[in-house]
């Protein structure tokens, strides 16, 4: 016999969405009498957020469905429902089981730069030099495509001097020089970087932008004939 069941549903789904089915067996006759007819009910829900009636169960099939809007993985990633199964169509003996409902992540949170402004200093002519690490926060599930950041230099890099990659563990944006900078030609670059996720947003979300002021430091260069 199974006294714990597990199911899953995407956060933000509409009421009426089916989650899972629980089953209790009763060897008594269910054709000519009600002795073997099982009726299901939800006895309790933990946690009771955003309120205590997030799910309903079909009395005769044991199918659990979402009954209320507001499933939010970032607030409650998992619900525990205590299910009662009662024979004689609800008037007889009762047994209890647990249904664990996983709330699966949707990309409903945008990554946000923190901080949004940076200043960096880079020696001229340095190629592959790490200029700055940009930090973002994202409330979606860590290490998922909805959390992993994708960085894009939106402006300020007219000469294609810079590149930005995502650190696989920290999720930081690592800004480096693609080619050497020339202090004499331009001693300051102001870059605008936008961050999104590997996964598309499931709703319209504002994208976060960071500003990086890069100061080019003069290096004493040998005279050229």
């Amino acid at each position: 016999t199974q006294d714990t069941f597990r199911g899953s549903v995407l956060e933000g789904v509409l009421p009426g969405t089916s989650v899972m089915q629980v089953t209790a067996t009763d060897e008594d006759d269910a054709i000519y009498t009600y002795n073997g007819v099982v009726a299901y009910s939800i006895h309790s829900q933990e946690p009771k957020d955003p309120h205590d009636l997030m799910f309903t169960i079909h009395r005769s099939t044991g199918t659990i469905s979402v009954i209320s809007s507001g499933l939010d993985r970032e607030k409650v990633p998992e619900y525990t429902l205590t299910i009662q199964a009662t024979d004689m169509d609800g008037d007889g003996s009762t047994t209890t089981a647990v249904a664990v409902v996983e709330i699966l992540d949707a990309n409903d949170n945008a990554p946000m730069f923190d901080p949004q402004k940076y200043e960096a200093h880079v020696p001229e002519n340095a190629v592959g030099h790490e200029v700055q690490r940009l930090t973002v926060t994202d409330l979606d599930a860590p290490n998922s495509p909805a959390w992993r950041a994708t960085y894009l230099i939106m402006g300020g890099d007219d000469g294609d001097h810079f590149t930005i990659t995502t650190h696989p563990e920290s999720n930081q944006g690592i800004l480096t020089t693609r080619k050497g900078l020339d202090f004499e030609a331009k001693n300051q670059h102001t870059l605008y970087v936008e961050v999104t996720n590997e996964a598309p947003f499931v709703l319209k979300l504002p994208t976060s932008t960071a500003t990086i002021v890069v100061h080019v430091e003069d290096v004493n260069e040998a005279p050229v004939f």
Partner: antibody, heavy 118, light 113 residues
Framework: QVQLQESGPGLVKPSETLSLTCTVS????????WSWIRQPAGKGLEWIGR???????IYNPSLKSRVTMSVDTSKNQFSLRLTSVTAADTAVYYC????????????WGQGTLVTVSS | DIEMTQSPDSLAVSLGERATINCKSS????????????LAWYQQKPGQPPKLLIY???TRESGVPDRFSGSGSGTDFTLTISSLQAEDVAVYYC?????????FGQGTKLEIK
């Protein structure tokens, strides 16, 4: 590297309340389940309860009437209160981190011994 | 609650030999939707907290030597140490996280013969 550190009184009188705090360093408290697990001397591990960063909790039914957990995300801390303690509550108390939907415990505190005695 | 039962309670194995610890759950911890077994293994040395070795029944935690392996599905699981080292002397626990009432096995004490 994420580190957890338990703190609180090592001695509690019978019928009083045991209070422990776990401080998380080297990483954010957000986005994880934080559990308390205890181990009486020479015995096995017993899960007490867990709290998520939004504050929702689930407790071991055998302790539910006596347990309260809380979280303070601004301090990167979470806490345990166990009321009406008896000698049977004497144990090493560990705090631990688990992932939502996959609550195995990858990070543990060193543990703190709490003795219930008059 | 899902009960976890380990066998044996204690085990003595010679250095370099294979050690096998079993864990049985009172109901299946396999979730058919993702085909994952919600089971973990821990090692605990005296005076230390437990250390995660294996999760999802067979996935080795980062930094854990490859002599440790986990296998099994449904209700029956095994932790194997392919070649016992002196530092492997410890108590080993299994844990299920299929139910939100997380439960551990009673532990298996591993010693050197």
């Amino acid at each position: 590297q994420v580190q957890l550190q338990e703190s609180g009184p090592g001695l509690v009188k019978p019928s009083e309340t045991l209070s422990l705090t776990c401080t998380v360093s080297g990483g954010s408290i957000s986005g994880y389940y934080w559990s308390w697990i205890r181990q009486p001397a020479g015995k096995g591990l017993e899960w007490i309860g867990r709290i998520y960063t939004s504050g929702n909790t689930i407790y071991n039914p055998s302790l539910k009437s006596r347990v309260t957990m809380s979280v303070d995300t601004s301090k990167n801390q979470f806490s345990l209160r166990l009321t009406s303690v008896t000698a049977a509550d004497t144990a090493v108390y560990y705090c631990a981190r688990g992932n939502p939907l996959a609550t195995y415990f990858g990070y543990w505190g060193q543990g703190t011994l709490v003795t219930v005695s008059s | 609650d899902i009960e976890m039962t380990q066998s044996p309670d204690s085990l003595a194995v010679s250095l370099g030999e294979r050690a096998t610890i079993n864990c049985k759950s009172s109901q299946s911890v396999l979730y058919s939707s993702n085909n994952k077994n919600y089971l973990a293994w821990y090692q605990q040395k005296p005076g230390q907290p437990p250390k995660l070795l294996i999760y999802w029944a067979s996935t080795r935690e980062s930094g854990v030597p490859d002599r440790f392996s986990g296998s099994g599905s449904g209700t029956d699981f095994t932790l194997t140490i392919s070649s016992l080292q002196a530092e492997d002397v410890a108590v080993y626990y299994c844990q299920q996280y299929y139910s939100t009432m997380y439960t551990f096995g009673q532990g298996t004490k591993l010693e050197i013969k």
